[in-house]
């Protein structure tokens, strides 16, 4: 004979366990149904009646099959330095991540609790290590023969142009200025010599993720800038 399918609630076999999406209720001493994501247990099971589930109330959620008496509260709305990458729904918590130009200074289980503006390296300093989602930019002084004349969280130190005759020598925060005769470059053999001063500097920019679109009802709250760090500016 085929084994009888047990309908919840039912008493498990001695030493047995409840099936998937069921839990053992200590009070009823029965295997009872769990509630699906987006719902919670409104009424717990008894020996004769199964769990009664109900939808999560506004701004609360459950992500897993559960038998919790109340859904979990969604996190606060994302601040203006963040984008909402996942909305609060009955089945998932809101996730806030830092917007471009910011990094996560204090993370939480999912998303970011506190964003800080990426450090900007001031003139005379270039980016030694670019910022990531979770780490700030590291600035370094421009080495002899290189310069940075920008306040930027992405620009590296660039080589001075090489002049036939130097009008003003370059320094850490300024390129060399050549006299009207054309400058030369250290170039590979066979390279074309361009008549105008052309910088060998490379444009170093960090790729920035496309900003996620928060709901059209997003409200913005102001957040102050992070304090400037060594070799950097808060502007």
């Amino acid at each position: 004979l085929p084994a009888q399918v047990a309908f919840t609630p039912y008493a498990p076999e001695p030493g047995g366990t409840c099936r998937l999406r069921e839990y053992y209720d200590q009070t009823a001493q029965m295997c009872c149904s769990k509630c699906p994501p987006g719902q919670h247990a409104k009424v717990f099971c008894t020996k004769t009646s199964d769990t009664v589930c109900d939808s999560c109330e506004d701004s609360t959620y459950t992500q897993l099959w559960n038998w919790v008496p109340e859904c979990l509260s969604c996190g606060s709305r994302c601040s203006s330095d963040q984008v909402e990458t996942q909305a609060c729904t009955r089945e998932q918590n809101r996730i806030c991540t830092c917007r471009p130009g910011w990094y996560c200074a204090l993370s939480k289980q999912e998303g970011c609790r506190l964003c800080a503006q990426l450090r900007k390296c001031r003139p005379g300093f270039g980016v030694a290590r670019p910022g990531t989602e979770t780490s700030d930019v590291v600035c370094k002084p421009c080495a002899p023969g290189t310069f940075s004349n920008t306040t930027s969280s992405t620009d590296i130190c660039r080589p001075h142009q090489i002049c036939h005759v130097v009008a003003i020598p370059g320094n850490a925060s300024m390129d060399a200025v050549c006299t009207s005769t054309s400058p030369t470059r250290s170039m590979a053999p066979g390279a074309v010599h361009l008549p105008q001063p052309v910088s060998t500097r490379s444009q170093h920019t960090q790729p920035t993720p496309a900003p996620s679109t928060a709901p059209g009802t997003s409200f913005l709250l102001p957040v102050g800038p992070s304090p400037p760090a060594e070799g950097s500016t808060g502007d």
């Epitope: 969604c74 909305a87 009802t217």
Partner: antibody, heavy 120, light 108 residues
Framework: QVQLVQSGSELKKPGASVKVSCKAS????????MHWVRQAPGQGLEWMGR????????KHDPKFQDKAVLSSDTSVSTAYLQISSLKAEDTAVYYC?????????????WGQGTLVTVSS | DIQMTQSPSSLSASVGDRVTITCTAS???????LHWYQQKPGKAPKLWIY???NLPSGVPSRFSGSGSGTDFTLTISSLQPEDFATYYC?????????FGQGTKVEIK
């Protein structure tokens, strides 16, 4: 842009009933609640109830449980408030307002209001 | 039900004054669920502060909100002519959701 447009003013006799409509545009009706708030002349705001248009689930202030019926028709993006057994004290402006799921009940857009006058 | 009591019920103030309106809940309200609305005569209310302290876009920064538990405040740092209106606090912590009776800010 987001808009909630309500039906026009109504003049009703005591004992009659009235149905006020609130047509939504500029947003997805999913994951929002539609609330009804009333304001008697010269008085404050009074929350009556709300409906989840996606499921039809409603919640009322117990005071309005037998008085107000909330419904919605997602095919025409419209929520309705029906008030029965009208009395003179039901004379008020009735507002619909929406709150997006996850915004902790903040009603960010309101209809222009519908004046219901109950008089014999 | 959670009762929301605003004080004062009305106040007269001059342009440039600092104005504070308080809202006291009869039991604790989570700060995420406390909102303020502004209403002008003959107009629908507008969401003015959400989740205790956050300003929707378009609300001037002279407005601020604070508080926790049972005591919440709306402050206008320097009253402007367009701020004369009635302000309502609103709790969405526990159903039935309730409003304060309103505070009317009038010109002195």
């Amino acid at each position: 842009q987001v808009q909630l447009v309500q039906s026009g003013s109504e003049l009703k006799k005591p004992g009659a009933s009235v149905k006020v409509s609130c047509k939504a545009s500029g947003f997805n009706n999913k994951d929002i609640y539609m609330h009804w708030v009333r304001q008697a002349p010269g008085q404050g705001l009074e929350w009556m109830g709300r409906i989840d248009p996606a499921t039809g689930n409603t919640k009322h202030d117990p005071k309005f449980q037998d008085k107000a019926v909330l419904s919605s028709d997602t095919s025409v993006s419209t929520a309705y408030l029906q008030i029965s057994s009208l009395k003179a004290e039901d004379t008020a402006v009735y507002y619909c307002a929406r709150s997006p799921y996850g915004d902790f009940g903040a009603m960010d857009y309101w209809g222009q209001g519908t004046l219901v006058t109950v008089s014999s | 039900d959670i009762q929301m009591t605003q004080s004062p019920s009305s106040l007269s103030a001059s342009v440039g004054d600092r104005v504070t309106i308080t809202c006291t809940a009869s039991s604790s309200v989570s700060s995420n669920y406390l909102h303020w609305y502004q209403q002008k005569p003959g107009k629908a209310p507008k969401l003015w502060i959400y989740s205790t302290s956050n300003l929707p876009s378009g609300v001037p920064s002279r407005f601020s909100g604070s508080g926790s538990g049972t005591d919440f405040t709306l402050t206008i740092s320097s009253l402007q002519p367009e701020d004369f209106a009635t302000y309502y606090c609103h709790q969405y912590h526990r159903s039935p959701w309730t409003f304060g009776q309103g505070t009317k800010v009038e010109i002195k």
